[in-house]
């Protein structure tokens, strides 16, 4: 697994550098997770032809993956810092069950999958510290998540491969949209 943010060789070599601000730490954390996703996507794409598949829509209908929309306040038009931050945190919390699903889906990148999951938990904590309106954040229901996980794990091999590909693709896009919005805050 890659070295967590704040522990890379550049930081070690430059002990007198200014400590990272909250925004810089969040930015770096997202970039770290994106690196992890990139490595996981490499394994997925090498293992199957899902990355070129045109049958994605079939599987996508069964997944309710978080996606950024204009109403969420994260786009330039209608940008609203608090609404957007709530959407980012809520979306990340919703992705957690899908990241749990990914845990047994990788052979050579098992550690990487765990790192993505753990780093996302840390990112959520960073963002919760930044949010003023924590009451507006809805936490997914554990029972619903448990049954969703069971359902996903019961799929046939092809659908499991497709689900893995779609989770990684959607999570990457959600993080990129979040990164873009957070840089405006």
């Amino acid at each position: 697994a890659p070295v967590p943010p704040g522990e890379d060789s550049k930081d070690v070599a430059a002990p007198h550098r200014q400590p990272l601000t909250s925004s810089e730490r969040i930015d770096k954390q997202i970039r770290y997770i994106l690196d992890g996703i990139s490595a996981l996507r490499k394994e997925t794409c090498n293992k199957s032809n899902m990355c070129e598949s045109s049958k994605e829509a079939l599987a996508e209908n069964n997944l309710n993956l978080p996606k950024m929309a204009e109403k969420d306040g994260c786009f330039q038009s209608g940008f609203n810092e608090e609404t957007c931050l709530v959407k980012i945190i809520t979306g990340l919390l919703e992705f957690e069950v899908y990241l749990e699903y990914l845990q047994n889906r990788f052979e050579s990148s098992e550690e990487q999958a765990r790192a993505v999951q753990m780093s996302t938990k840390v990112l959520i904590q960073f963002l919760q510290k930044k949010a003023k309106n924590l009451d507006a954040i809805t936490t997914p229901d554990p029972t619903t998540n448990a049954s969703l996980l069971t359902k996903l794990q019961a799929q046939n091999q092809w659908l499991q491969d497709m689900t893995t590909h779609l989770i990684l693709r959607s999570f990457k896009e959600f993080l990129q949209s979040s990164l873009r919005a957070l840089r405006q805050m």
């Epitope: 330039q76 693709r169 896009e173 990129q176 949209s177």
Partner: antibody, heavy 119, light 107 residues
Framework: QVTLKESGPTLVKPTQTLTLTCTFS??????????VGWFRQPPGKALEWLAL???????RYNPSLKNRLTITRDTSKNQVVLTMTNMDPVDTATYYC??????????????WGQGTLVT | DIVMTQSPATLSVTPGDRVSLSCRAS??????LHWYQQKSHESPRLLIK???QSISGIPSRFSGSGSGSDFTLSINSVEPEDVGVYYC?????????FGAGTKLELK
Amino acid sequence: QVTLKESGPTLVKPTQTLTLTCTFSGFSLRTSGVSVGWFRQPPGKALEWLALVYWDDDRRYNPSLKNRLTITRDTSKNQVVLTMTNMDPVDTATYYCARSYDDYLYYALDYWGQGTLVT
Amino acid sequence: DIVMTQSPATLSVTPGDRVSLSCRASQSISDYLHWYQQKSHESPRLLIKSVSQSISGIPSRFSGSGSGSDFTLSINSVEPEDVGVYYCQNGHSFPLTFGAGTKLELK
């Protein structure tokens, strides 16, 4: 391979609206991390960023020109269109479109069109 | 807006020279700094991204360094075809801004 090409009028009268089209190939504006931007360069001067559209149709504009600019995209035609209202002689420049594509949204512009001179 | 200041404005060099072009940002932009080369009557070409990352197809004589707000583009042995204007760009925050450029010419 990746290519971008600007098209539009070469001559515009003061107060008129300029409409420029960027037609691209070799990549999709539906891929997350991809954005296409418009830039201009007056003769003998530096580059200036104008506007940018993302894979999910979010947009950014240069605040100094925001009320004059509109950027739109047509993913089916692989085109990005820039309109600039109330043209003035000081807007004489070579107008470029360029692509950025990276996971971190660093906005490094790895492919550029050939540019179109608008007077 | 983040102002990018490049120096010198013009650099007269002899082929084989090692040269350094400077770029300073008005505030810290971390590693969101890119370098472009523009030859006469051509479009800009990305040379270096994120301070020091090399770009496929760009000769290895071009390298970048720096962090925060001070950056350098180095050409370790100038070739005649390197003549042109070099721009640095802020990719950290909007509006995206460019330096005024450093013109590289032969003595």
